[in-house]
Interface confidence: medium
């Protein structure tokens, strides 16, 4: 229904706390360089304005769209051009072009230092002094680094953060309590960030139809007892919600997400038997719980998929009458039977089925032509199954760090032109798939591995798109979203690459490496490994093992030495010489 004042409507629906959090996220995602203090001032102004509109919907400017109100606020910031350059040009445009312009200027890799977690005591002091400001800083810091983070989900993580601090700051050993709990929240949030970026990429590049197909497959897996019309209703709503969040309509997105949770909880009987526990929770936790819900049990009496989609004499007629609905039904029926497949695989199978019908329904004997379609799915299913098997075996053999290094070598050979920091980030994330997925039961491995890899590769594509350097990466990233992972997996050593000059300074290290946290130490070593591969793309596994082992010993030895600086200065050149020799 239409409301006189959109901003008043959202304020009333969301409540002041969530309203303010969402406005802060919106501003932080649009203007990623502004300090917290500047954004919080704008948030307060917008909130005060919303309150006047709640009191009187006819008050001046209350009838303006939220994009107009937010855009006007952002464009009124002094020195906008000095800080943001051409983003200031957006302000010359009218809505909706102005908002589109802001969206295009979102930076997936902003030049911001990594978010450093303060020491436990200091954290607890500032949290206890002003919890609202502390959590506001958290929203701001995460949102500006992840401009597509799913806003209502970020509010949920802020709530989790709050819970952890409330609990741990009363403990005697605050650090022991905080570290593992905050690490767990951080890990979940980082995965959520890449997953949501993938959804926004899907929406931006391929439109709502492609996203809705993804949603139909996902919902059908989770709710196999729901009928097709129910699944499409949920998929339509989820598509709308994600479109809003990806488009910067964060208030509407969060409001609609809460509405969907309410609808699901009111209609559990026609959706799933597993929802009740989620439905007893408060709104943010309820939505998050529903998004992570375990699959319902598959109905016992499902007929073979072949009955409706291969053996039925009316297949071509049904397909011709309403292609989207017929294919949607196929995707639904196949997905509800296969919670053990990744969504990417299910979409590839649906695409194969569509291509088969397009070809066969134009021929003389369609049933004979499409009769073997299900058998033709076999190679498409085997490929990701083999990927999971080989990669999980390698992970089990090498552990996370070793597996990351193996992935780093593989991807540096595939795309040596890509910058080393991007390759290291991608390989570290891809390598985490082992820890995340390989320990799961067999039936959950494939969906976990492939859908996680797809999200990480999407991040690689997004970064590469900004500064394209590898034709092979461009080719894999330009194709369909569901074909990306197989495309990257199929890449081999780039024969066109001219090896990088051996630069001694790339492999020169100093005593500062000794005081780095383990993670930073690993990144230093992995940076050196990528550079080695760029210098010698065809180096054997043994050669790389020798050099990296030598390097690890060198760092270990010098960090234990009495005169660390002297050790690095004298042993360093010897290491470089030995490395050159080993790779010759």
């Amino acid at each position: 229904e239409a409301h006189k004042s959109e901003i008043a409507h959202r304020f009333k629906d969301l409540g002041e706390q969530h309203f303010k959090g969402l406005v802060l996220i919106a501003f932080s995602q649009y203007l990623q360089k502004c300090p917290y203090e500047e954004h919080i001032k704008l948030v307060q102004e917008v909130t005060d304005f919303a309150k006047t509109c709640v009191a009187d919907e006819n008050a001046e400017n209350c009838d303006k769209s939220i994009h107009t109100l937010f855009g006007d606020k952002l464009c009124a910031i002094p020195k906008l051009r000095d800080n943001y350059g051409e983003l200031a040009d957006c302000c010359a445009k009218q809505e909706p072009e102005r908002n589109e312009c802001f969206l295009q200027h979102k930076d997936d890799n902003p030049n911001l230092p990594p978010f450093q977690r303060p020491e436990a005591e200091a954290m607890c002091t500032s949290f206890q002094e002003n919890p609202t400001s502390f959590l506001g800083h958290y929203l701001h810091e995460v949102a500006r680094r992840h401009p597509y983070f799913y806003a209502p989900e970020l509010l949920y993580y802020a709530e989790k953060y709050n819970e952890v601090l409330t609990q741990c700051c009363t403990e005697s050993d605050k650090a022991a309590c905080l570290t593992p709990k905050l690490d767990a929240v951080k890990e979940k949030a980082l995965v959520a960030a890449v997953r949501q970026r993938m959804k926004c990429s899907s929406m931006q590049r391929f439109g709502e139809r492609a996203f809705k197909a993804w949603a139909v497959a996902r919902m059908s897996q989770r709710f196999p007892n729901a009928e097709f019309a129910e699944i499409t209703k949920l998929a339509t709503d989820v598509t709308k919600i994600n479109k809003e969040c990806c488009h910067g309509d964060l208030l509407e997105c969060a409001d609609d997400r809460a509405e969907l949770a309410k609808y699901m909880c009111e209609n559990q009987a026609t959706i799933s038997s597993k929802l009740q526990a989620c439905c007893d929770k408060p709104v943010l936790q309820k939505s998050q719980c529903l998004a992570e819900i375990e699959h319902d049990n598959i109905p016992a009496d499902l007929p073979s998929i072949a009955a409706d989609f291969v053996e039925d004499k009316e297949v071509c007629k049904n397909y011709a009458e309403a292609k989207d609905v017929f294919l949607g039904t196929f995707l639904y029926e196949y997905s509800r039977r296969h919670p053990d497949y990744s969504v990417s695989l299910l979409l590839r199978l649906a695409k194969k089925y569509e291509a088969t019908l397009e070809k066969c329904c134009a021929e003389g004997d369609p049933p004979a032509c499409y009769g073997t379609v299900l058998a033709e799915f076999q190679p498409l299913v085997e490929e990701p199954k083999n990927l999971v098997k080989t990669n999980c075996e390698l992970y089990e053999k090498l552990g996370e760090y070793g597996f990351q290094n193996a992935v780093l070598v593989r991807y540096t050979q595939k795309a040596p032109q890509v910058s080393t920091p991007t390759l290291v980030e991608a390989a570290r994330n891809l390598g985490r798939v082992g820890t995340k997925c390989c320990t799961l039961p067999e039936a959950q491995r494939l969906p976990c591995v492939e859908d996680y890899l797809s999200a990480i590769l999407n991040r690689l594509c997004v970064l590469h798109e900004k500064t394209p350097v590898s034709e092979k990466v461009t080719k894999c990233c330009s194709g369909s979203l569901v074909e990306r992972r197989p495309c990257f997996s199929a890449l081999t050593v780039d024969e066109t690459y001219v090896p990088k000059e051996f630069k001694a300074e790339t492999f020169t290290f100093h005593s500062d490496i000794c005081t780095l946290p383990d993670k930073e130490k690993q990144i230093k070593k992995q940076t050196a490994l990528a550079e080695l591969v760029k210098h010698k793309p065809k180096a054997t596994e043994d050669q790389l093992k020798t050099v990296m082992g030598d390097f690890a010993q060198f760092v270990d030895k010098c960090c234990k030495a009495a005169d660390k600086d002297n050790c690095f200065a004298t042993e360093g050149p010897n290491l470089v010489a030995r490395s050159k020799e080993a790779l010759a």
């Epitope: 097709f228 499409t232 209703k233």
Partner: nanobody
């Protein structure tokens, strides 16, 4: 016992309009998706439109998109089909049906109402 009773059919000129109704009883209407199907003389059953239990979303066969509108009133247990810009090829017996879990198998449908489009 499930009962579906269609009405509103009749003779109409090409370009004209009709509104079909379907009164439902014997099941919980407001938790069931519903659809309209039709059967032209000498032809097989063709689905026309589907509506979710809540009223949205709705789906249409390509042949009727933009001309037909499906709607429902859950408080009256009634399903509707507004048909505009009617064509000769829309001539058929129209049935309302309770939507099952498989798209192309219909659990229950009524006795139908005949729509004839002719000048």
């Amino acid at each position: 016992e499930v009962q579906l009773l269609e009405s509103g059919g009749g003779l109409v000129q090409p370009g004209g309009s009709l509104r079909l109704s379907c009164a439902a009883s014997g099941f919980t209407f407001d938790t069931s998706s519903m659809l309209w199907v039709r059967q032209a003389p000498g032809k097989g059953l063709e689905w026309v439109s589907v509506i979710h239990q809540s009223g949205t979303p709705t789906y249409y066969a390509d042949s009727v998109k933009g001309r037909f509108t499906i709607s429902r009133d859950n408080s009256k247990n009634t399903l509707y089909l507004q048909m505009n810009s009617l064509r000769a090829e829309d001539t058929a017996v129209y049935y309302c049906a309770k939507f099952p879990s498989s798209q192309f198998r219909f659990d229950y449908w009524g006795q139908g109402t005949l729509v004839t489009v002719s000048s």
